[in-house]
């Protein structure tokens, strides 16, 4: 019989990661921290009304990659970033705007601004 | 094989501090959490917080805030739990337990912490 | 915080019984990144640790006798013993592991008739 706090080894687990979360936590959060197997990340994206929206959190592992690779959307301004280094990595990501395309404005819905 | 080494017993006066430990071998320490639990006599179980050995980020229970401060030294695998202003409530057996994705897979034997003058 | 209630607070069995108790959190386990339900059990033998039996809901521990047995989704989770041993006296809890606080149900106690 093992001691009682002895055991055999731990197969090796993905090992849970903490990120900041900001308007996307989930429910019951505490400290605006979410937990896991994934990604951390920070995405501005532009509203409805062209102003600039930060949102940060947790994406799990399985599709994170797609989600975090930054591809383009015909006329939605938004970018990402992610990061896996350290517990509340995403804190230091600034993710900013892509530029305006003069073709933003022709084929998109026309902004006053 | 996993090893959570812990004191069996703490005597300690009222108003005092207590600094309990656990010691870690049979796996990378950095590669698991570490956490501690909170059992009072007959009673149930209680997330105090938890601690990543690896950049030494830690998470409180609200509960636990300014009662208990977690630490590693990872040079000797061993985890930290200082509990300070001591009363009759913190008398209790204190359980260190490593996670990878915050469920206990390996838990200490405990030390029983008796606050008493 | 989630809230975790077990049911019923004690029971007892005899040998060979089929044992069922109860689980339920105040908020679903659920993540829909992964179809995983994050809720673990653990057996507390008297003057013992408590020991890992089942997470993730359903996934059985390396060790763990099969007559264990986790089920449940959403909020309401069960441990089932299939066949009860004398040795399976002990006090079984719950815990959520989906986000921090990290929370446990108060227990259920087993005893043997």
């Known amino acids: 019989k093992k001691e009682d706090g002895e055991s055999t080894a731990p197969t090796p687990r993905p090992k849970v990661l903490r990120c900041k979360c900001h308007h996307h936590c989930p429910e019951d959060s505490v400290n605006n921290i979410c937990s896991t197997d994934g990604y951390c990340f920070t995405m501005i994206e532009e509203d409805d009304s062209g102003l600039p929206v930060v949102t940060s959190g947790c994406l799990g592992l399985e599709g994170s990659d797609f989600q975090c690779r930054d591809t383009p959307i015909p006329h939605q301004r938004r970018s990402i970033e992610c990061c896996t280094e350290r517990n509340e990595c995403n804190k230091d990501l600034h993710p900013t705007l892509p530029p305006l395309k003069n073709r933003d404005f022709v084929d998109g819905p026309i902004h006053h601004r | 094989q996993v090893q959570l080494q812990q004191p069996g017993a703490e005597l300690v006066k009222p108003g005092a501090s207590v600094k309990l430990s656990c010691k870690a071998s049979?796996?990378?320490?950095?590669?698991?959490?570490m956490h501690w639990v909170k059992q009072r006599p007959g009673q149930g179980l209680e997330w105090i917080g938890d601690?990543?050995?690896?950049?030494?980020?830690?998470n409180y229970n609200q509960k636990f805030k300014g009662k208990a401060t977690l630490t590693v030294d990872t040079t000797s695998s061993t985890a930290y739990m200082q509990l300070s202003s001591l009363t009759s409530e913190d008398s209790a057996v204190y359980y260190c337990?490593?996670?990878?994705?915050?469920?206990?897979?390996?838990w200490g034997q405990g030390t029983t912490l008796t606050v008493s003058s | 915080d989630i809230v975790m209630t077990q049911s019923p607070s004690s029971l007892a069995m005899s040998v060979g019984q089929k044992v069922t108790m109860s689980c339920k959190s105040s908020?679903?386990?659920?993540?829909?990144?992964?179809?995983?339900?994050?809720l673990a059990w653990y057996q507390q033998k008297p003057g013992q640790s408590p020991k890992l039996l089942v997470y993730?809901?359903?996934t059985r521990e390396s060790g763990v006798p099969d007559r264990f047995i986790g089920s449940g989704s959403g909020t309401d989770f069960t441990l089932t013993i299939s066949s009860v041993q004398a040795e399976d006296l002990a006090d079984y809890f719950c815990?959520?592991?989906?986000?921090?606080?990290?929370?446990f149900g108060a227990g259920t106690k087993l005893e043997l008739k």
């Open positions: 993730f809901a359903s």
């Open positions: 815990q959520q592991h989906y986000n921090i606080p990290l929370t």
């Open positions: 601690i990543d050995p690896s950049d030494r980020y830690t």
């Open positions: 908020q679903s386990l659920l993540k829909s990144s992964n179809q995983k339900n994050y």
């Open positions: 049979g796996y990378t320490f950095t590669s698991y959490w």
């Open positions: 337990a490593i996670s990878g994705w915050d469920y206990f897979d390996y």
